[in-house]
Interface confidence: medium
């Protein structure tokens, strides 16, 4: 049997912890240092944990050593400390902070935990938020004090200030659009809403401190986007309200966003705001929600997708049992990272239940969704018979899946950074989620997919998508299965003597490592945890070669489709070449621009779709009040402005070039003179002269690029 | 620099007419809507109606349908605007102003404004 | 018609304070995700002076103390700090249909 053969796969450490927590929070310090931090603690979810135990490892998982003694309150103290979480700093990997759940203590470290100091601070870490470029600087929350307050400590948590009360929630502003140690905070107001306030020295003096939104619901803060909700109340109504979206994209004043819709909002969700536009769920007062994207700037959103699966306590699903499991919303929306574009969603048609959901996935961000192709043939090789005109097709596990299924917890669909393309599922083929699970791949960006592996698995990948690794789920088993060809194949290593429980499959994040930490249990009766790394360099063989890249696009698997006029070419390394890309591979990608076609346009401002939706052509709106063509006012002669044909360049679209875009864009002329005498055009190869009749001057037109200049036109009218 | 320059004030008797004119500098009045609005004293505005001077069609308010009408001469750079049959609730300070493409309908630029005044 | 209700009619506030007004449309000025609705000041003797057009663009030269907000049919004014210059009347106007028509005016006193 292949256990053996000399195996490719080694397990290179293996240690028992003697640890009954019933969680295990992991942290690899990254930056190619071997620490590995764990702390386990009990379930969070009902109460505070009544003990915790850490552990460091400093050879990336081989041995784990117990640190808890060290996390005491001083002399004469025998008090054990209590760890509900401990924070990395994302400035300095040698730094983390363990804060106690009940004490105001917290404990640092400035040397990858190998001393740790103690120090009694003036409240209680509920959350802490540490700076990402300054390391001293972190921000600290009072979540149980009556008067929610915020705290500051610039000596990386040994003294602290207050610095707000009241506090709903808080940030750090986000480079580079804010300036350096901004803060945003949410503030409770007597009304019951709240402020949003930013503030660049820490509320120390008004000068800095600027009110961003006033009587806000929520709000929150996104890379280039901010976002919050309002209450409005409807005209003529006392009882029905509805809420608003306010955005700001690039840190202007917040806006409220417009909504094609007749129904009431109760409330947003946002989905997505990582490409330079918006994906909002809205959620209407019929319990069902919509999925809504924006142009750039996030304030005018139109309707992509109906009837997308979104929970929410207390709105959408709080009367199912989901509310017993879910205190945060969430939607089953899912970005194909790595790419632009390309997302999955779940439908959902009646109750939240698995037989009413369906998944649907978009390669234009959203312009039209499809369900997903189901894949030919089983892992053994028959055929499935499933057609799409049937209604059958392949659906595809996601956050409401995993609720659904407490005792054998579904996996997230996994897609990332370092496999553009490749993504693995939990999911079943028919006409909804209900059938049967297995595990999905697809390598070519949701376009085509095949079913991997049967029943429900753990799954994780190393070495940029180089090889896969999974273990099944709801068994014990001593069975690690992995491929290096993208899923096509898989073998076998048996990775203990004994079945151990597992209870996860993790690789260091960023997943260009080769090697796998396998988290279970080995005590028949008691659960104790139980960590074994698992290395896989050797199943890759060498080094990759320039000859075992290909280079692919997305745009290959939809007949070389542009999106948003770019189409974007990736290194590949070919799924049946056996060696491994390293841990510094650097994937190139070329994004090369395509020609524009008319789907690269919309109608530009006072302009709709003529009534003959085939020509696709945009015409004059009879509705729109304003003067079409007109130059702006003031428009000094000499200089020149954009007149609109009444297209635009859809936002974000890169495309150039071609008929399309001649035809279509707006054209630069020359700014009109403001009182006209009669006069002569006449044209001398390289430029176009204007004789004024009345006084006899001459002057040339600010016109560039001519060439042979042999006839010319003049519009009269503009 | 654009401006709309106005008529100087004017003194009628009921039943009269007046015409009113409105000179714009620095930009072609073609490339815009000239409208006209109506101040009584005291009071707000209200929007009498506007001329597209590219090709003279013009948009009224109902409620000066008839009372009011609004010409331009590009030559000039000029618009009009010609009130008939006055009476006292015609007094008023009467504005010129411009829109265009740019400004989605909101009005820019304006006139220093005529005063009307219809009196026995 | 569109008719545009004003509130309040008169407004009294501090100097450094926040003034805000309202402006409400018996049917909606939103044209495709645009809202033509726009904000001008007029003191007394001189012409109306735009200062926000389409809901909340400030036109530029307005000092950044004004701001315009709102969507649909509802809309508002602020003017934060208020200083003695603003002392004003304040009319909103739609271009979403003709003919286009003014609110009824607030007069932004100093308390």
């Known amino acids: 049997s292949a256990a053996l053969q000399p195996e490719p796969i080694k397990v290179y450490g293996q240690v028992s912890l003697n640890d009954s927590h019933n969680q295990m929070v992991v942290h690899w310090a990254g930056e190619k240092s071997n620490v590995i931090v764990a702390l386990a603690r009990d379930s969070l979810a009902l109460a505070r944990p009544k003990s915790s135990d850490v552990y460091v490892s400093y050879d990336y998982g081989k041995s784990f050593k117990k640190i808890s003694d060290k996390l005491n309150f001083g002399l004469g103290n025998r008090s054990e400390a209590v760890i509900a979480q401990f924070y990395h700093s994302p400035a300095d990997n040698k730094r983390y902070i363990f804060a106690d759940a009940y004490a105001q203590y917290l404990w640092i470290t400035f040397d990858f935990c190998n001393t740790l100091q103690g120090f009694s601070i003036p409240f209680r870490a509920a959350d802490l938020l540490l700076h990402s470029k300054a390391s001293n600087l972190l921000l600290g929350f009072d979540r149980s004090h009556p008067n929610k307050q915020l705290w500051k400590s610039d000596d990386f948590g040994q003294t602290w200030i207050m610095i707000q009360e009241h506090v709903k929630s808080f940030s750090w502003g986000i480079d580079p659009y804010d300036k350096p140690n901004t803060i945003y905070i949410e503030r409770h107001e007597p009304s019951g809403y709240s402020t949003v306030f930013r503030s660049t020295d820490f509320f120390q003096s008004r000068e800095n401190q600027e009110v961003i939104l006033e009587e806000v619901r929520d709000f929150q803060l996104r890379d280039k986007y901010m976002f919050a909700t309002k209450v409005v109340h409807l005209l003529g109504s006392e009882q029905q309200s509805s809420v608003q979206l306010w955005v700001s994209f690039g840190r202007k004043p917040m806006r409220a966003a417009q909504f094609v819709t007749r129904h009431p909002i109760n409330e947003y969700y946002i989905a997505d705001a990582s490409e330079d536009q918006v994906f909002v769920c809205v959620s209407h007062s019929n319990n069902r929600t919509n999925l809504y994207i924006s142009e750039a700037e996030g304030l005018k959103f139109s309707l992509s997708l109906e009837n997308v699966l979104y929970y929410s306590p207390g709105g959408a699903g709080s009367d199912t049992l989901v509310r017993y499991f879910a205190n945060e919303p969430f939607a089953d929306f899912h970005r194909v990272e790595g790419l632009q574009g390309v997302y999955i969603a779940t439908l959902i048609n009646g109750s939240m239940n698995e037989e009413n959901m369906r998944s649907v996935i978009t390669f234009d961000k959203g312009g039209t969704w499809e369900f997903l192709q189901a894949p030919a043939f089983t892992g053994y090789g028959e055929k499935i018979n499933c057609e799409l005109s049937q209604g059958c097709s392949l659906h595809l596990a996601q956050r409401l899946s995993q609720l659904l299924n407490l005792q054998l917890r579904r996996m997230p669909i996994l897609s990332k950074e370092s496999a553009p393309g490749l993504i693995i599922a939990t999911g079943s083929v028919g006409k909804n989620l209900a059938s049967k699970t297995n595990v999905y791949i697809s390598s070519s960006a949701g376009a085509r997919w095949r079913e991997a592996l049967p029943g429900p698995h753990y799954y994780t990948w190393g070495d940029h998508g180089g090889i896969i690794t999974a273990i099944a789920q709801g068994m014990e088993t001593n069975e690690l299965k992995y491929s290096t060809n993208e899923g096509e194949t898989w073998k076998t290593f048996i990775f203990s003597e004994k079945p151990v429980f597992v209870y996860g499959l993790l690789t260091e994040p960023g997943e260009k490592s080769t090697v796998f930490t396998i988290f279970g249990s080995n005590k028949e009766n008691v659960h104790s945890w139980l960590i074994l790394q698992v290395n896989a360099t050797d199943a890759l063989g060498v080094p990759c070669t320039e000859n075992d890249y290909k280079l692919w696009s997305p745009s290959d698997e939809r007949g070389n489709e542009c999106l948003l006029g770019h189409k974007t070419v990736f290194k590949r390394r070919t799924p049946h070449a056996t060696c491994f890309n390293g841990e510094d591979f650097d994937r190139p990608v070329v994004v090369s621009n395509c020609s524009c076609t008319r789907e690269d346009y919309e109608c530009d401002f006072g302009f709709k779709m003529s009534e003959d939706l085939s020509l696709e052509v945009c015409v004059p709106d009879p509705e729109f009040s304003g003067k079409s063509y007109s130059p702006p006012v003031p428009c000094p002669v000499g200089s020149t402005y954009r007149r609109t044909r009444g297209y635009r360049k859809i936002s974000g679209d890169t495309c150039s070039g071609g008929d399309v875009e001649a035809r279509l864009e707006g054209e630069l002329v020359p700014c009109p003179l403001a009182e006209e005498n009669e006069f002569i055009l006449y044209a001398v190869r390289k430029s176009i002269y204007r004789y004024d009749l009345a006084s006899g001057a001459t002057e040339q037109l600010p016109l560039t690029g001519l060439r042979a200049a042999v006839a010319l036109d003049f519009d009269y009218e503009h | 620099e654009v401006q709309l320059q106005q008529s100087g004030a004017e003194l009628v008797k009921p039943g009269a007419s007046v015409k009113l004119s409105c000179t714009a500098s620095?930009?072609?009045?073609?490339?815009?809507?000239i409208h006209w609005v109506k101040q009584r004293p005291e009071q707000g505005l209200d929007w009498i109606g506007r001329?597209?001077?590219?090709?003279?069609?013009?948009k009224y308010d109902p409620n000066f349908q008839g009372k009011a009408t609004i010409t331009a001469d590009t030559s000039s750079n000029t618009a009009y605007l010609q009130l008939s049959s006055l009476a006292s609730e015609d007094t008023a300070v009467y504005y010129c102003a411009t829109s265009n493409y740019y400004s989605r309908g909101a009005m820019d630029y304006w006139g220093q404004g005529t005063s009307v005044t219809v009196c026995s | 018609d569109i008719v545009l209700t004003q509130s309040p009619a008169s407004l009294a506030v501090s100097l450094g304070q926040r003034a805000t007004i309202s402006c409400r449309a018996s049917e909606s000025v939103e044209y495709y995700g645009t809202n033509l609705m726009h904000w001008y000041q007029q003191k007394p003797g001189q012409p109306p002076k735009l200062l926000i057009y389409?809901?909340?663009t400030v036109k530029s030269g307005v000092p950044a103390r004004f701001s315009g907000s709102g969507s649909g049919t509802d809309f508002s004014l602020n003017i934060h700090p208020v200083e003695e210059d603003d002392i004003a009347m304040y009319f909103c106007?739609?271009?979403?249909?003709?003919?286009?028509?003014f609110g009824g005016g607030t007069r932004l006193e100093i308390k």
């Open positions: 389409v809901a909340s």
């Open positions: 106007q739609q271009s979403r249909k003709v003919p286009w028509t």
């Open positions: 001329i597209d001077p590219a090709n003279g069609n013009t």
């Open positions: 620095g930009f072609n009045i073609q490339d815009t809507y």
